[in-house]
């Protein structure tokens, strides 16, 4: 803790400004009113304080707000956010998307830190659900965000938010996560016509059941092999050779290259050899 010293005459801070970078740690502690600091947090980021000086400023805010900073302070933390621990952040009540964006901006370009993960968790829990604007924001900063959530957490995503999801946001999702997201996507895109619908639903198909794949095979969708390989094995197995041929269209030839990999391998083993031969790809059941 900074030693107990009275502020030297004439050094009491009236503003948060550049002159404070010349203050020793104990002078910052003694001469800067925590209430002034809280009000002028937006100025801190424009001043090249040392890490040690930032520690003093954080300590002052912690003393004034031991139960958690108000949002008016949080929104302007800037790079002081990097000094916060997950324990600090758990005390916050962040309700404004602007506040969330401001803090994510500070961490931009870095992996999702424990601090950011805690911040997002506090924000989403405070909102009660992962709405479209929040999802838009989070996936813009962290494309893998959606796939970092548990199936239980994903269940709070309303179908309307699915419109914010881009294919790359689902790259690292596992089948359990897609099982939760697919029905939401199906609901969200239900009023679109065939080809537009397929473009939107394609990246969610890893959660699709057999009956939906059968329905898609009737729509000339020409699914690519990459999408087909991500389908649930249990959903693919009941498909007939004719249905797979219709589902893949011109991409059916790609099955040969994937014949040793799931779900293609397991599907081939379920088919009659006569049916496989109609594809003319030399697939052996």
């Amino acid at each position: 803790e900074v030693e107990k010293t009275a502020c030297p005459s004439g050094k009491k801070a009236r503003e948060i400004d550049e002159s404070l970078i010349f203050y020793k740690k104990w002078e910052l502690e003694a001469c800067v009113d925590a209430a002034l600091l809280a009000t002028q947090m937006d100025r801190v980021n424009a001043i090249p304080f040392t890490y040690e000086q930032l520690d003093v400023l954080k300590h002052k805010l912690d003393e004034l707000y031991p139960q958690g900073y108000p949002e008016s302070v949080i929104q302007h933390l800037g790079y002081l956010f990097l000094k916060m621990s997950p324990e600090d952040i758990r005390k916050w009540n962040v309700t404004s998307l602007e506040t969330l964006k401001a803090l994510l901006e500070v961490n931009k370009g870095h992996e999702m830190s424990p601090q950011v993960a805690t911040l997002i968790d506090r924000f989403v829990k405070g909102r009660g659900q992962l709405d479209k604007d929040t999802l838009d924001t989070l996936t813009a900063f962290y494309p893998g965000y959606l796939c970092s959530l548990s199936p239980e957490e994903l269940s709070s995503v309303p179908p309307s938010s699915i419109w914010a999801v881009r294919p790359q946001d689902l790259d690292t999702c596992d089948p359990r996560q897609l099982d939760v997201l697919y029905p939401k996507a199906r609901l969200a895109f239900q009023n679109m016509n065939g080809s537009e619908y397929f473009v939107k639903i394609q990246s969610f198909l890893g959660g699709a059941p057999t009956e939906d794949l059968k329905a898609l095979s009737q729509q000339n969708v020409s699914m690519d092999l990459a999408t087909f390989m991500k389908l649930r094995t249990d959903a693919v197995l009941p498909l007939t050779v004719a249905e797979v041929q219709k589902l893949l269209g011109p991409h059916v030839e790609g099955l040969k290259a994937e014949e040793r990999h799931r779900p293609v391998r397991d599907w081939i083993l379920r088919q009659r050899q006569d049916d496989l031969d109609t594809l003319g790809l030399g697939l052996q059941g």
């Epitope: 803790e1 009275a6 502690e29 001469c31 009113d33 209430a35 009000t39 004034l64 031991p66």
Partner: antibody
């Protein structure tokens, strides 16, 4: 249920000393900053001082020198040592838990100190 | 040290009235101001902190506003239970805690 209970008040002669205690139940005092506030009969509230979590003490300018705030974490108790007491120190003395943004959210019921010959 | 000046010192109003109490600081305290309610023989009760944040369990008819040196406590619709003395509290948080309370405003029901 969180409760603060002050004790140690009573009649004391001018120039005398008194130590007030504030014992807590339902909260760990070491996890909070704590303060003392007094109220003379029929008058308003007057701030005495605060001890923070790290043990640093802040006093009102008038209280420096005569009044000392301390805590014993093992006994979960806050203290106010008052020396060189005067008639104008007659008041109800409250201990209170510092909450947030300069405020005190939990107060004891108060203990009356009467300085009189 | 900072001085806090409250006005009026006493006010009388009817149930349902909108009541306003003002508090002036001798120098800027930014937004770090609290309001308390005290009834005779009882300890003060925290109503509002950080100028406008309602403490837990406080009815929404109480609200606070202001910044710098001028602050206001408003009771939107006075109730019988609101008869009490109200105190503002502000301060300076640096090498000392220059905390000060206002002189109090006694609210009576007509």
């Amino acid at each position: 249920q969180v409760q603060l209970v002050e004790s140690g008040g009573g009649l004391v002669q001018p120039g005398g000393s008194l130590r007030l205690s504030c014992s807590a139940s339902g909260i760990d005092l070491s996890s909070y900053a704590m303060g003392w506030v007094r109220q003379a009969p029929g008058k308003g509230l007057e701030y005495i001082g605060t001890i923070n979590i790290g043990g640093r003490v802040y006093y009102a300018s008038w209280a420096k020198g005569r009044f000392t705030i301390s805590r014993d974490n093992s006994k979960n108790t806050l203290y106010l040592q008052m020396n060189s007491l005067r008639a104008e120190d007659t008041a109800v003395y409250y201990c209170a838990r510092y909450y947030n943004g300069g405020s005190y959210d939990i107060w004891g019921q108060g203990t009356l100190v009467t300085v009189s010959s | 040290d900072i001085q806090m000046t409250q006005s009026p010192s006493t006010l009388s109003a009817s149930v349902g009235d909108r009541v306003t109490i003002t508090c002036q600081a001798s120098e800027s305290i930014y937004r770090v101001l609290a309001w308390y309610q005290q009834k005779p023989g009882k300890a003060p009760k925290l109503l509002i902190y950080d100028t406008s944040t309602l403490a837990s369990g406080v009815p929404s008819r109480f609200s606070g506003s202001g910044s710098g040196t001028e602050f206001t406590l408003t009771i939107s619709s006075l109730q019988c239970d609101d008869a009490a003395t109200y105190y503002c509290q502000g301060g300076y948080y640096a090498d000392s805690y220059g905390i000060a309370f206002g002189g109090g405003t006694k609210v009576e029901i007509k």
